[in-house]
């Protein structure tokens, strides 16, 4: 097993999470890349990169776009419109087979709550969006667990729609370390 | 071979202004995020502005944003920054690098740029 | 804006040696840190991105480790080639940042 560290993103309804997930070029630049759920101990692939990559050549399903960078070793993640229902954990995947994913980046527990997005909290717990407006508000705790790195059992992948990106970016803060255990 | 090479350089009034230039080979410049890093004399790294690779997205380091502009032309390979209202702040070897989504993969051998009366 | 800072400023090492390299950010950046070397009059040179992941061409005798918000840049045998500054780069906030530098010298 491999201990991987979890952050956890607090965010308001309508924002909009952005993860980048490295990767080695030299091993999986030409690797399809993916975004999954954990459903229970299930991971859902809920979008997935062509194949092979093509540096920027955005994937779009729904609320979810991928963008892969092969020459920088980067997989760009971003959700627009956060809802509650969202909340969850998160992990970035090089696909290599339906029933087998390697987990890239350590994953993300994402916490979406009702409320005003236009507006930032305190200054202690908030970060200025250096691109874009609105600017927006993330939390990022850091707990940890344990985790092997193959996920199997994959269930049925989403329909992937080539569209353009999001346009918000939200930036986090670490706060709080706790352990949590995630598979068994 | 991969190369940036940055021009432009010179020595310029404060208020002055001035257009750097990057000339790409050896790779895919069309498929790649550039930057513009800079060094001033004896110090560090400071990264001055990004666009994406089909110029829909530009983005600057606070200290230079409305006095400088990044763009590029893929057809020619070139990638430039207009710099306006210079200061003597500004004074540093500009560095042409590609990247800008993460990490700056390729550098050039950097340009000097010095703004003084 | 993310505040990387490294230590210490300078680091005196025999060829040989192990050397040890910290980097601290005043936020998680999670995994998105790279480490650069630049030696006097060149163009820095990617060392690692991702936090440990080695760019291409690097020798094995450098590794990075760390996460969120404290990370190392280790050169398990230091060669003549290998005394320069480096630093490390966060790209987890778009305002990219670098940390101000150590200067590796031969002691």
């Known amino acids: 097993t491999t201990e991987l560290t979890e952050e956890k993103y607090e965010y308001k309804e309508g924002q909009t999470l952005e993860v980048k997930c490295d990767y080695a070029l030299e091993k999986y630049a030409n690797s399809r890349k993916a975004w999954q759920k954990m459903e229970g101990k299930m991971p859902k692939i809920l979008a997935k990169t062509e194949r092979p990559s093509e540096n920027s050549h955005p994937v779009q399903v729904g609320r979810i776009t991928l963008e892969d960078y092969p020459d920088h070793g980067l997989l760009q993640v971003r959700m627009t419109n956060l809802q509650v229902e969202d909340s969850g954990l998160y992990q970035c995947v090089i696909y290599q087979h339906p029933k087998e994913s390697h987990v890239l980046f350590n994953p993300i527990c994402l916490v979406v709550t009702k409320g005003s997005s236009g507006t930032p909290g305190s200054s202690e717990n908030s970060t200025q969006n250096v691109y874009r407006t609105p600017s927006t508000t993330a939390k990022a705790l850091g707990p940890r667990y344990t985790s092997p790195r193959t996920v199997t059992q994959a269930p049925p992948e989403s329909t992937v729609v080539v569209s353009t990106p999001g346009s918000e970016i939200n930036l986090t803060n670490v706060t709080d370390i706790i352990r949590v255990p995630v598979f068994n | 071979e991969v190369q940036l090479v940055e021009s432009g350089g010179v020595l310029v009034q404060p208020g002055g202004s001035l257009r750097l230039s990057c000339a790409a080979s050896?790779?895919?410049?069309?498929?790649?995020?550039m930057s513009w890093v800079r060094q001033a004399p004896g110090k560090g790294l400071e990264w001055v502005a990004n666009?994406?690779?089909?110029?829909?997205?530009?983005y600057y380091v606070d200290s230079v944003k409305g006095r400088f502009t990044i763009s590029r032309d893929n057809a020619k390979e070139s990638l430039f920054l207009q710099m306006n209202s210079l200061r003597a702040e500004d004074t540093a070897v500009y560095y042409c690098?590609?990247?800008?989504?993460?990490?700056?993969?390729?550098w050039g051998q950097g340009t000097m740029v010095t703004v003084s009366s | 804006e993310i505040l990387m800072t490294q230590s210490p400023a300078t680091l005196s090492v025999s060829p040989g040696e192990r050397a040890t390299l910290s980097c601290r950010a005043s936020q998680s950046v999670s995994s998105n840190l790279a480490w650069y070397q630049q030696k006097p009059g060149q163009a820095p040179r990617l060392l690692i991105y991702?936090?440990?992941i080695r760019a291409t061409g690097i020798p094995a005798r450098f590794s990075g480790s760390g996460s969120r918000t404290e990370f190392t840049l280790t050169i398990s045998s230091l060669q003549s080639e290998d005394f320069a500054v480096y630093y490390c780069q966060q790209y987890k906030n778009w305002m990219y940042t670098f940390g101000q530098g150590t200067k590796l010298e031969i002691k």
């Open positions: 690098a590609r990247g800008g989504i993460s990490t700056f993969d390729i």
């Open positions: 050896g790779i895919t410049f069309s498929n790649s995020w």
């Open positions: 991702g936090a440990s």
């Open positions: 666009i994406k690779q089909d110029g829909s997205e530009k």
